[in-house]
């Protein structure tokens, strides 16, 4: 379970049409459900219910986004449509280049993601909790344009990869 270094770049637009970028760093863990590799994409926030096998959404997504999913307390969904691993697979099937789960309210999900699948996903599946999860959700809840970059080593410079 290696450390995942996540950088989130938030874009704030000004009335003149220019963008100011804010970079926030946080850490999570690569789960065994996915690959330990780098990924980058625009953040798409998703409720876990939205990762059920519902074919009504097939037209909604392109490839290359990073799914951010805040898991609920298990008692809110006693009979989930899919396991957490199944939901990660569903996101990747829909075009996610990586999935980040906030497991703060469902810590049992960590074991589910780390059980080790015979057929792990070829994309990273990261989980965050505690202060890092709060930081991530504060950004995501702003509903602004944001990109996430996931790395398996600490970034050398927070903004080196971002070319305006």
């Amino acid at each position: 379970k290696e450390t995942a270094f996540v950088e989130v770049v938030l874009f704030e637009s000004s009335p003149s049409g220019d963008y100011t970028t804010y970079t926030t760093g946080l850490t999570g863990r690569f789960s065994r459900a996915g690959a330990t590799l780098s990924a980058e994409g625009e953040i798409v926030q998703m409720h876990p219910l939205g990762l059920c096998n519902n074919n009504d959404e097939e037209d909604l997504y392109e490839y290359g986004w990073v799914g951010v999913v805040k898991l609920e307390q298990p008692e809110l969904d006693p009979k989930p449509c899919l396991t957490v691993l199944g939901k990660a697979k569903r996101a990747v099937q829909r075009g996610a280049t990586a999935v980040i789960f906030d497991v703060s309210e469902n810590p049992e999900a960590i074991d589910q993601l780390n059980q080790g699948s015979e057929d792990p996903l070829k994309r990273p599946v990261v989980y965050v909790k505690g202060a890092d999860a709060i930081k991530l959700m504060n950004i995501v809840n702003k509903q602004k344009v944001a990109r996430a970059r996931i790395q398996h080593r600490p970034p050398r410079q927070p903004t080196e990869y971002f070319d305006m």
Epitope: E42, V44, Q45, M46, H47, L49, C52, E62, Q143
Partner: antibody, heavy 119, light 107 residues
């Protein structure tokens, strides 16, 4: 903050068409579906259909199939709803609304466009 | 199409009252249910989605519960700004459909 700004009120004659625009700003345009919902005077809410801004895929309510067309212009982050063969019962406020965390749960709404159909 | 039935269609209540509105779907919609508040001349405002998840920025006096076909919106202590019309809406399958609305008036 995400904002959806709609075009102004329209008065149309029966049989005509109307095209309402909805310009998105302050958030990701391409990643969340935009729906159109209408509300006749003193009545409830009625979903007309939705468009996926990235792919342009549409789903329309059967009631409006053949009369409604939803399109988008990614260069201006704008979606459009055109309703043809207008009749008096199409007089309503038309809203565009954007998904938030969950498909079909609309956290962001335009201010509404009143379309009046009258001879 | 899935029919959504709200009750009551209107109710009178006082500031500080606990208010409960129910919504029933004609078939199971799992937890694909949202609640909206609408004031005259304004666009609806999302309060709850996924049956029980509070939308960011919505006061915690609003809560939702239910799964399958029966759902409830509760306002634990009614405030002056809560007098409005409330709608439930399913997004389990298209066409997405709304309840007919519940108007909460001042007693």
């Amino acid at each position: 903050q995400v904002q959806l700004v709609q075009s102004g009120a329209e008065v149309k004659k029966p049989g005509a068409s109307v095209k309402v625009s909805c310009k998105a700003s302050g958030g990701t345009f391409s990643s969340y579906a935009i729906s159109w919902v209408r509300q006749a005077p003193g009545q409830g809410l009625e979903w007309m259909g939705r468009i996926s801004p990235n792919r342009g895929g549409t789903k329309y309510a059967q009631k409006f199939q053949g009369r409604v067309t939803m399109t988008r212009d990614t260069s201006t982050s704008t979606v459009y709803m055109e309703l043809s063969s207008l009749r008096s019962e199409d007089t309503a406020v038309y809203y565009c609304a954007r998904d938030s965390w969950l498909r079909g749960a609309w956290g962001y709404w335009g201010q509404g466009t009143l379309v009046t159909v009258s001879s | 199409d899935i029919q959504m039935t709200q009750s009551p269609s209107s109710l009178s209540a006082s500031v500080g009252d606990r208010v409960t509105i129910t919504c029933r779907a004609s078939q199971s919609i799992s937890r694909w249910l949202a609640w909206y508040q609408q004031k005259p001349g304004k666009a609806p405002k999302l309060l709850i989605y996924a049956a029980s998840t509070l939308q960011s920025g919505v006061p915690s006096r609003f809560s939702g519960s239910g799964s399958g076909t029966d759902f409830t919106l509760t306002i634990s202590s009614l405030q002056p700004e809560d007098f409005a019309t409330y709608y439930c809406q399913q997004s389990f399958s298209t066409p997405y459909t709304f309840g007919q609305g519940t108007k909460v008036e001042i007693k």
